[in-house]
Interface confidence: low
Amino acid sequence: GCLTQLYENAFFRGGDVASMYTPNAQYCQMRCTFHPRCLLFSFLPASSINDMEKRFGCFLKDSVTGTLPKVHRTGAVSGHSLKQCGHQISACHRDIYKGVDMRGVNFNVSKVSSVEECQKRCTSNIRCQFFSYATQTFHKAEYRNNCLLKYSPGGTPTAIKVLSNVESGFSLKPCALSEIGCHMNIFQHLAFSDVDVARVLTPDAFVCRTICTYHPNCLFFTFYTNVWKIESQRNVCLLKTSESGTPSSSTPQENTISGYSLLTCKRTLPEPCHSKIYPGVDFGGEELNVTFVKGVNVCQETCTKMIRCQFFTYSLLPEDCKEEKCKCFLRLSMDGSPTRIAYGTQGSSGYSLRLCNTGDNSVCTTKTSTRIVGGTNSSWGEWPWQVSLQVKLTAQRHLCGGSLIGHQWVLTAAHCFDGLPLQDVWRIYSGILNLSDITKDTPFSQIKEIIIHQNYKVSEGNHDIALIKLQAPLNYTEFQKPICLPSKGDTSTIYTNCWVTGWGFSKEKGEIQNILQKVNIPLVTNEECQKRYQDYKITQRMVCAGYKEGGKDACKGDSGGPLVCKHNGMWRLVGITSWGEGCARREQPGVYTKVAEYMDWILEKTQSSDGKAQMQSPA
């Protein structure tokens, strides 16, 4: 299953399949997730090692047992690939690294006013993979405000150096934020020229395109079909690039198919997995296991559950079957693609779904970096779990926020439904940033069931929590995916990086905001909070957040929305915006329902009819 824990001061010994430089452990984990053989990783921060060559070293590892011996190494961080982790799987990495220069091939230099502008330029350049920005205080005046766009053969920096007044980061193309746009067309009987960056075997052009999309240097591809004239070249998928970013020429050629990477698509990227099953096809590779199962779908599920399995063949040969079960061959290769593809067989083949991010399990999401008073505008995909709860009586209006916690579940505040318990007046909008973007044609979810905590009473602050079951499950995308729930009774974790988001008022007597707002707010102890609210009982089932001096807070319209905290690179839903005395007043923190205290209730209510929990806490 999905293992999200990180091991500090530990290094996995042996099992190396690749190494690279990455700015932090989270990026290293992402590279491990997308590497076909990587199950474990170890990362060496700059502070952990004197050897300059190994600083920022990211070591990707494989193990037939799924684990490796851990040795103590001060400062090192190790962990697991996020294969099988559903919606946590994303190549999107938004972080900016201060005081770090990520080296690569510098192919473009320009003057810009901020690191955000530099990141935007990188995201809008087809060849840019990462960038470095020299700030206004950089020691050499002529380099100040320089934005260097970079690439490298592997898509990761060729070296990372500690350098004052330099900030670095990655292109946000994998976040589906590129302004370039993409070519969805597939060109039959056409071969593209230019440089081949890799070759793999695929059963069709669509798998070839997905592999191209997630390959660091592939911009376009040519696929040779299974009836291509040269037998040894059949099913070859050539991943290609060029200096200009587009094919310099194309040749009409029977039985070839060409197309483009979809990495530059805006708002939607293909999933990094291949779900189609290919009847009459055998996939060759290294044998991992052979098991008897009933049906090709069970074979695919078996492959998906066995983390090292990359693809499979289900044989229907009489000698491979007994009763209703037939042999399911679980296989792998060095590059994640079959080493041989044979047609006209009595088998059916396909791929593991371990990198699909629409899996049933709602495990924690780690990927993504509130009107809120004193807040700032959010950007696309920054808070993909945030939803807007709107009421349509006569005019439609935003009333509350909420958090997506599963394909069919939203967590919000009970008081949002005071006087409005009718489920058919509510519309739930997910995957949006600007309320003004909502038109009559914008898709929304309807409510199947409102589950208000049984101990909640109107006009009381206690047990201010409610679950919404949606009529239809939502698909996960970079802009619409769930937030991780905390562990039951989570009291030991000290959260230092917490944010509240919402479209609520920007001042006490204000109005709903158009752009989703965010504000960074520190947590306050319950003892401190109780001192500020002597007329109310601050219980252990509440959590408070706010600045002593005020100025930043949630406000009307933010209710029900998330208070999220980032810990070990993972976002968790710590609180639900509930109540407070006014908004952003001095020494009057906001009060939030403490989600960890309600985990039993949430899990009980979200049990599906077949008895499996729809939600899952971090491992």
């Epitope: 020229s193 081949d196 890799a198 040269i230 040894s232 310099s248 020429s249 040749t251």
Partner: antibody, heavy 118, light 107 residues
Framework: EVQLLESGGGLVQPGGSLRLSCAAS????????MNWVRQAPGKGLEWVSS????????TYADSVKGRFTISRDNSKNTLYLQMNSLRAEDTAVYYC???????????WGQGTLVTVSS | DIQMTQSPSSLSAFVGDRVSITCRAS??????VNWYQHKSGQAPKLLIY???SLQSGVPSRFSGSGSGTDFTLTISSLQPEDFATYFC?????????FGGGTDVQIR
């Protein structure tokens, strides 16, 4: 029968130029990427340059980048290598080779000797 | 660039011997390795492509194996005409690179 025949080699002074040709026959020349590979006396094989089937894209080894130019004329079934600013270390037998889909060189010419010496 | 390290650099063997030559890539390259035979004054000849596929017209005593970083060319029963220099080459990425060569001599 596939045949590749190189020509144009010879003795040249450092800093001089030469143009190698490779005449192809026995296959549809315009469908295959082509390459130049060289072997210096007593040394191993070194890839020099490649050109796509249409001639639209070219790549070079770092050691010759900016000095050598690969080109092809599909109407004449001929591959070329223009070598400028020649150096003593460019002395080698130069082979033209056809590239099959997996990047192997399935047919080679007999080679032409280029000697750069004063 | 991907380095291809070939060993041994030379070997001497009897006719009928089984001979193996290895090639190690500096990074993982799937199965994109090709093997060539080169005799002095002649054009090199492709023996094996894609690590293990036998080029048409090449005798079946030649075989290739390996994937990732380690590759082997095996001649199951050495014949007089097999005495030559053998090269491996990676075609995983540009620039294409060759191993240093193995000189197979008659003992």
């Amino acid at each position: 029968e596939v045949q590749l025949l190189e020509s144009g080699g010879g003795l040249v002074q450092p800093g001089g130029s030469l143009r190698l040709s490779c005449a192809a026959s026995g296959f549809t020349f315009s469908q295959y990427p082509m390459n130049w590979v060289r072997q210096a006396p007593g040394k191993g094989l070194e890839w020099v340059s490649s050109i796509s089937s249409s001639g639209g894209f070219t790549t070079y080894a770092d050691s010759v980048k900016g000095r050598f130019t690969i080109s092809r004329d599909n109407s004449k079934n001929t591959l070329y290598l223009q070598m400028n600013s020649l150096r003593a270390e460019d002395t080698a037998v130069y082979y033209c080779a056809r590239e099959e889909q997996q990047g192997g060189f399935d047919y080679w010419g007999q080679g032409t000797l280029v000697t750069v010496s004063s | 660039d991907i380095q291809m390290t070939q060993s041994p650099s030379s070997l001497s063997a009897f006719v009928g011997d089984r001979v193996s030559i290895t090639c190690r890539a500096s990074q993982t390259i799937s199965v994109y390795v090709n093997w060539y035979q080169h005799k002095s004054g002649q054009a090199p000849k492709l023996l094996i492509y894609g690590a293990s596929s036998l080029q048409s017209g090449v005798p079946s005593r030649f075989s290739g194996s390996g994937s990732g970083t380690d590759f082997t060319l095996t001649i199951s029963s050495l014949q007089p005409e097999d005495f030559a220099t053998y090269f491996c080459q990676q075609s995983y990425s540009i620039p294409f690179t060759f191993g240093g060569g193995t000189d197979v001599q008659i003992r």
